[in-house]
């Protein structure tokens, strides 16, 4: 009866063809493929990416979009012209050939295309709200493209300053670098030049030492030849003053005897005679070195030779190398006989050591050692000691075995410090020790506490500075 | 003049805790290491702890090891010992004492009890149920 066909054109289109009788009407309509499907739903709520999506493609779709709806309209237009054309002919040529029956086919195909435009029509009001859906979709994608753009952007200028203010700080710091480098050049020279310069008045100060030291040797040798003459000559003045006193008719007139000009020690200048404390002269065998010496008489059997006494602060003992070695202060008074005596002399025969203390409290205790000597200046003076009697501590304050002896311009203690500068004075520092007789001298209500006083651990315990001290030294078999 | 003062002792019972401070003035804390001391009725002077607050340093004895803690804040300059898990043999007056941090022997690692010159007058704590 009618027969319907379908098919593709090479524009994409759709063909629509009525065949009927010797009559064949066609209709191109457009085919919408590029309008997304209703079977292929859109996720709206889709998670935002940081980077717009290809917006120029967007934007093409939609004018394709608008393009397809602009032909639909036009070609429905000219549809329904058609139609109407179309009728007016075909009812004319019904009338003219008054077939009756092509009226109703005539009917039929309008129907037909009726019902074809109502289709397209539903199609086309379809396409209208997908596109403008994918209008809203588009305007909602390109506002958070544009945020995301815009907080891109911002993050860059932030970036961009933060990157400029570490480059002003960076340029400011090199800068400060070479201002330091440059001083610390003209530091370094300055240093080298006064080095060079130092390095020059040490030597000069060497070689003015060294005539120094010649003329004390000398002057030494002069006085103690001086000294020789001298007592030679009131030898001879006392041998004429006794054979002028002795009468003519004397049978023997005799010579006094000449008194032992020498003593090494104070226990020789006891066994001489002379039994009062006081200020003696010294001088070692084979040597014409004398010291002055104060010899305690009167202690525990007498002849104590006084190597160290500390008794009112008048005497700094913050002194060098070469002040302990030789001796300095007062005899009579607070002072350190020297080293050298007192290694030279402990060293030609046996001796102890006694310690004398006292504390402020009105208390007195004594350290007692039986054996007791210095070693050279080679090994630095250090102290020996045996066997420890006595009311100032059972264990020795002086650190055992003996150390070395340090002063502050010579560190031979066994401490990572340099204990006679922390601790003053000149010691047997160990690290730095349990005791220190040179340390600072404190007054009464001011001697606790102390890190530098005149400490002996093992009678009074740390930080307490007593009031004075003895050390002295006898011949072991006197 | 230097002076330390301790404070925090008190009576406590067997397994209970106490915090001793040591409030140190006229030295700085970074200078000096501080320690820790007791001594318990007819015993000697015995070494519990000690602080070099400059290393953050510390030492502890035998005894108290895991139980006592000892630290610092130097900008109150005191020194405090936190004592847990007690024992009735931890019953002893606790002193503070402070050493020039330098005054150390080559290789050694702490003080002897000979080095600390400046002390507290003490603190006793007594464990006791």
């Known amino acids: 009866y009618n027969n319907f066909r379908k098919s593709m054109d090479s524009i994409g289109k759709k063909q629509y063809q009525v065949q009927h009788g010797s009559c064949s009407y066609t209709f191109l309509l457009p085919e919408m493929d590029n309008c997304r499907s209703s079977s292929s739903p859109y996720v709206s709520n889709a998670v935002q990416r940081d980077a717009p999506l290809e917006y120029d493609d967007s934007v093409q779709r939609l004018q394709v979009l608008e393009n397809i709806m602009e032909n639909n309209t036009q070609w429905l237009m000219k549809l329904e012209n058609y139609i109407q054309d179309n009728m007016k002919k075909e009812m004319v040529e019904i009338q003219q050939n008054a077939v009756q029956n092509q009226t109703a086919v005539m009917i039929e195909i309008g129907t037909n295309l009726l019902n074809q435009t109502a289709e397209q029509t539903r199609k086309l009001t379809d396409v209208e709200a997908q596109v403008l859906n994918q209008t809203t979709r588009l305007e909602l994608q390109l506002l958070e493209h544009s945020l995301s753009t815009n907080k891109l952007e911002k993050q860059i200028l932030d970036q961009t300053s933060e990157i400029n203010k570490l480059q002003d700080k960076n340029s400011f710091l090199e800068k400060k670098v070479l201002a330091m480098e440059d001083k610390h050049i003209i530091q370094l020279q300055s240093i080298k030049e006064e080095k060079d310069q130092l390095q020059v008045l040490v030597s000069k100060q060497n070689s003015i030492i060294e005539e120094l030291e010649k003329k004390i040797v000398t002057a030494t040798v002069n006085n103690s030849v001086l000294q020789k003459q001298q007592h030679d000559l009131m030898e001879t003045v006392n041998n004429l003053l006794t054979m002028m006193s002795t009468s003519n008719s004397a049978k023997d007139p005799t010579v006094a005897k000449g008194e032992q000009i020498s003593f090494r020690d104070c226990a020789e200048v006891f066994k001489s005679g002379h039994t009062t404390n006081g200020v003696y002269t010294l001088t070692l065998p084979n040597s014409t070195e004398e010291v002055k010496a104060y010899c305690d008489m009167e202690a525990g059997g007498g002849g104590w030779t006084i190597i160290q006494r500390r008794e009112d602060g008048s005497v700094d003992f913050q002194r060098t190398w070469k002040e302990y070695k030789v001796g300095f202060g007062n005899p009579s008074g607070e002072y350190w006989l020297g080293n050298e005596f007192v290694s030279q002399l402990t060293n030609q025969q046996r001796y102890v050591l006694k310690i004398h203390l006292k504390d402020w409290e009105g208390n007195e205790a004594y350290s007692l050692y039986e054996h007791f000597y210095l070693s050279s200046e080679e090994l630095n003076y250090r102290i020996h000691l045996k066997g420890l009697t006595g009311t100032a501590g059972k264990i020795s304050s002086i650190s055992q075995p003996g150390n070395d002896f340090s002063t502050k311009d010579a560190d031979n203690d066994k401490c990572i410090c340099k204990c006679s500068q922390m601790l003053t004075g000149g010691w047997w520092f160990d690290a730095c020790g349990p005791s220190n007789l040179n340390g600072m001298y404190y007054p009464q209500r001011q001697n606790t506490n102390k890190f530098n006083g005149i400490k002996w651990y093992y009678w009074k315990g740390s930080g307490y500075s007593l009031k004075g001290t003895t050390m002295m030294i006898r011949p072991a078999g006197f | 003049d230097v002076q330390l003062v301790e404070s925090g002792g008190g009576l406590v019972q067997p397994g209970g805790s106490l915090r001793l401070s040591c409030a140190v003035s006229?030295?700085?804390?970074?200078?000096?290491?501080i320690g820790w001391f007791r001594q318990a009725p007819g015993k000697e002077r015995e070494g519990v702890s000690a602080?070099?607050?400059?290393?953050?340093?510390?030492y502890y004895a035998d005894s108290v090891k895991g139980r006592f803690t000892i630290s610092s804040d130097n900008s109150k300059n005191t020194v405090y010992l936190q004592m847990n898990s007690l024992r009735p043999e931890d019953t002893a007056v606790y002193y503070c004492?402070?050493?020039?941090?330098?005054?150390?022997?080559?290789?050694?690692?702490?003080?002897?009890?000979?080095?600390?010159?400046?002390w507290g007058q003490g603190t006793l704590v007594t464990v006791s149920s």
């Open positions: 004492a402070a050493v020039p941090a330098g005054r150390l022997r080559y290789g050694e690692q702490w003080y002897p009890i000979y080095e600390y010159d400046a």
């Open positions: 602080i070099r607050s400059s290393g953050g340093s510390t």
């Open positions: 006229g030295i700085t804390l970074d200078d000096y290491a």
